[in-house]
């Protein structure tokens, strides 16, 4: 029974179970394509266990391979909107430190009003993830339509 | 070698590895938008390790943060069908106990015939997840086109 | 503190943390619908920890339940391209051994230019996963647009 006892005695963070699920707070000013996120039990079903928010962007606290997932739905959208709107693209990437800047995940909203995807990627302590929404349209702030999260998978 | 031995001796369920992957059984009667699921090795590649089915709906047995994922494909569908029958929407939520009722994940089929997404969410023992498909179109029962699952991630 | 020490001493592979994230290498010759993958730190952010590549196809090394995920974006694509070249379909399945051949995940590109999905599925040591892209359109090789991965979840 030793393992179960040890597992209970150690803080979960030491097991490397870093995880976060965020909801949209707001979009940036016009020249800033970033989405700004928020999380915490007071806000509903969003949370941060390990990672932190830095001015609405997600900062990683533990090295490892992470599953990154996102869903973004456009606020006012029908199939006719989607087919005629300004090219709208979502990209998730490491935006700081600048030396590690890279796009991890990119999707366009062609004739749809929602994009959703996920991927495994190595992240390092201090990496900040940014989600850039290019185009003129607003994302929905409904918590079941737009969300962003990470899950530590292994060292 | 103590850790590996201890891990093997303990039942997997005690490690909190609850997981389920379900295939579509049938849709509900006309006024019931719920999809009814089934799972088990006899049915193919679906399974339940921890969670249970209650009248075709998934009931959680262990508190924790879960990764919930779903894919639903419409059965007889082209992009024109999908746009003509708009709105067809899928919502995954906690439907009981009523006090915890909430929509966790919502997607519309606009001009597409498949939706797929995933999210992290806290679930409690006894929570029952329902998947509501609104609209007149029928979902495919092909096991590689329509499926629904959960994976326990951490306490 | 015994658990943490034991965890550090054991090789990660013995914990069952098999994981892989691949990037597209190339498509097959005309009669071969398979996508050919590559992975490794020298290529960027792709990696294989446990599973292996066999002629561009992913081979599983450990029995268990896996989360399989994929995103494929068509290379030169607009919503009109996608609808004109319909049907373009992606299927992920076990292609060998032949006795276990089965389609695990299937999606069509109706009016969209990207598909993304994920599912839980049991896989056995020696299973080789193939990703078949049917249709005339080419997939993007950008590493943030097209990727394929697996993550061991539990025995």
């Amino acid at each position: 029974q030793r393992f179960a006892q040890a597992q209970q005695q150690l803080p979960l963070e030491s097991l490397g179970w870093d995880v976060a699920e965020l909801q949209l707070n707001h979009t940036g000013p016009q020249q800033d394509p970033r989405l700004y996120w928020q999380g915490g039990p007071a806000l509903g079903r969003s949370f941060l266990h390990g990672p932190e928010l830095d001015k609405g962007q997600l900062r990683i606290h533990r090295d490892g391979i992470y599953m990154v997932h996102i869903q973004v739905t456009l606020a006012i959208c029908s199939s006719t909107t989607a087919s005629r709107h300004h090219p709208t693209t979502l990209a998730v990437g490491i935006c700081s430190p600048a030396s590690r800047s890279i796009s991890l995940l990119r999707l366009s909203f062609h004739q749809g009003c929602t994009i959703a995807s996920q991927r495994l990627t190595p992240l390092a302590r201090g990496d900040t993830l940014c989600t850039n929404l290019t185009g003129t349209l607003l994302p929905s702030r409904n918590t079941d339509e737009t969300f962003f999260g990470v899950q530590w998978v292994r060292p | 070698q103590r850790f590996a031995q201890a891990q093997q001796q303990l039942p997997l369920e005690s490690l909190g590895w609850d997981v389920a992957e379900l295939q579509l059984n049938h849709t509900g009667p006309q006024q019931d938008p719920r999809l009814y699921w089934q799972g088990g090795p006899a049915l193919g590649r679906s399974f339940l390790h921890g969670p249970e089915l209650d009248k075709g709906q998934l009931r959680i047995h262990r508190d924790g943060i879960y990764m919930v994922h779903i894919q639903v494909t419409l059965a007889i569908c082209s992009s024109t069908t999908a746009s003509r029958h708009h709105p067809t929407t899928l919502a995954v939520g906690i439907c009981s106990p009523a006090s915890r009722s909430i929509s966790l994940l919502r997607l519309s089929f606009h001009q597409g015939c498949t939706i797929a997404s995933q999210r992290l969410t806290p679930l409690a023992r006894g929570d029952t997840l329902c998947t509501n498909l609104t609209g007149t179109l029928l979902p495919s029962r092909n096991t590689d086109e329509t499926f629904f699952g959960v994976q326990w991630v951490r306490p | 503190q015994r658990f943490a020490q034991a965890q550090q001493q054991l090789p990660l592979e013995s914990l069952g943390w098999d994981v892989a994230e691949l990037q597209l290498n190339h498509t097959g010759p005309q009669q071969d619908p398979r996508l050919y993958w590559q992975g490794g730190p020298a290529l960027g952010r792709s990696f294989l920890h446990g599973p292996e590549l066999d002629k561009g196809q992913l081979r599983i090394h450990r029995d268990g339940i896996y989360m399989v995920h994929i995103q494929v974006t068509l290379a030169i694509c607009s919503s009109t391209t996608a609808s004109r070249h319909h049907p373009t379909t992606l299927a992920v399945g076990i292609c060998s051994p032949a006795s276990r051949s089965i389609s695990l995940l299937r999606l069509s590109f109706h009016q969209g230019c990207t598909i993304a999905s994920q599912r839980l599925t049991p896989l056995a040591r020696g299973d080789t996963l193939c990703t078949n892209l049917t249709g005339t359109l080419l997939p993007s090789r950008n590493t943030d647009e097209t990727f394929f991965g697996v993550q061991w979840v539990r025995p």
Partner: antibody, heavy 119, light 115 residues
């Protein structure tokens, strides 16, 4: 067919308050973009404020920020503009404009309601 | 903040074609905005004409004749409204609007006179 009808205009003194209403029909109100646009006598159109989808977003022109508040009552399919600390410069015809599926456009316009601010 | 400049007035003969311009200030790119056009006749509310981003991404207002079309001139950083086969009833004020992420801006308007 999208239709909007404004009401609530009138003559007000500087510093006063007024609430404009806009009754909408022919579309799903809660999933739409609703706006107020004004036109001063002999002048061009000026965007005032917009509210988007389930009241999740509200935006204002700099000229009215902190003085005007846009809101909706989805049950009544009605848009409101609460105007406080009115100035003579706010004198204009106020139009309600709606778009049911594209936030960047003013697809359907009302006839307008006159607001005059004068001592 | 985006600023849209339109020529105050323009006149043309019936049957001719006319091009109305809507120039965005240099700090902003026309490609970053949704440009739409509105017609307002004396004593009436404005009417939505069209939206144009590209040939494949455009929208014509309900009941708006195909004589009205949109375009952009990237080199001039401008949106364009093209009216062909000009008719007397086209005499009106024409306004362009630029939209991005919640905020709208109107141009000053062009008074089109059909001689």
């Amino acid at each position: 067919q999208l239709q909007v009808v404004e009401s609530g205009g009138g003559l007000m003194q500087p510093g006063g308050s007024l609430r404009l209403s806009c009754a909408a029909s022919g579309f799903t109100f809660s999933g739409s973009a609703m706006s107020w646009v004004r036109q001063a006598p002999g002048k061009g159109l000026e965007w005032v404020s917009s509210i988007y989808s389930h009241s999740m977003y509200t935006y204002y022109a700099d000229s009215v920020k902190s003085r005007f508040t846009i809101s909706t009552d989805n049950a009544k399919n009605t848009l409101y503009l609460q105007m406080n600390s009115l100035k003579p410069d706010d004198t204009a015809v106020y139009y309600c404009a709606a778009s049911s599926d594209y936030e960047g456009l003013f697809v359907s316009w009302g006839q307008g309601t006159q607001v005059t601010v004068s001592s | 903040q985006a600023v849209l400049t339109q020529p105050p007035s323009l006149s043309a003969s019936p049957g001719s074609s006319v091009r109305l311009t809507c120039t965005l200030n240099s700090a902003n790119s026309v490609g970053s905005y949704d440009i739409s056009w509105y017609q307002q006749k004396a004593g009436s509310p404005p009417r939505y004409l069209l939206y144009y981003y590209s040939d494949s991404l455009s929208h014509q207002g309900s009941g708006v004749p195909s004589r009205f079309s949109g375009s952009t001139d990237a080199s001039a950083n401008a949106g364009l409204l093209l009216i062909s086969g000009l008719q007397p009833e086209d005499e009106a004020d024409y306004y362009c609007s630029a939209y991005n992420r919640g905020s709208h801006v109107f141009g000053g308007g062009t008074k089109l006179t059909v001689l």
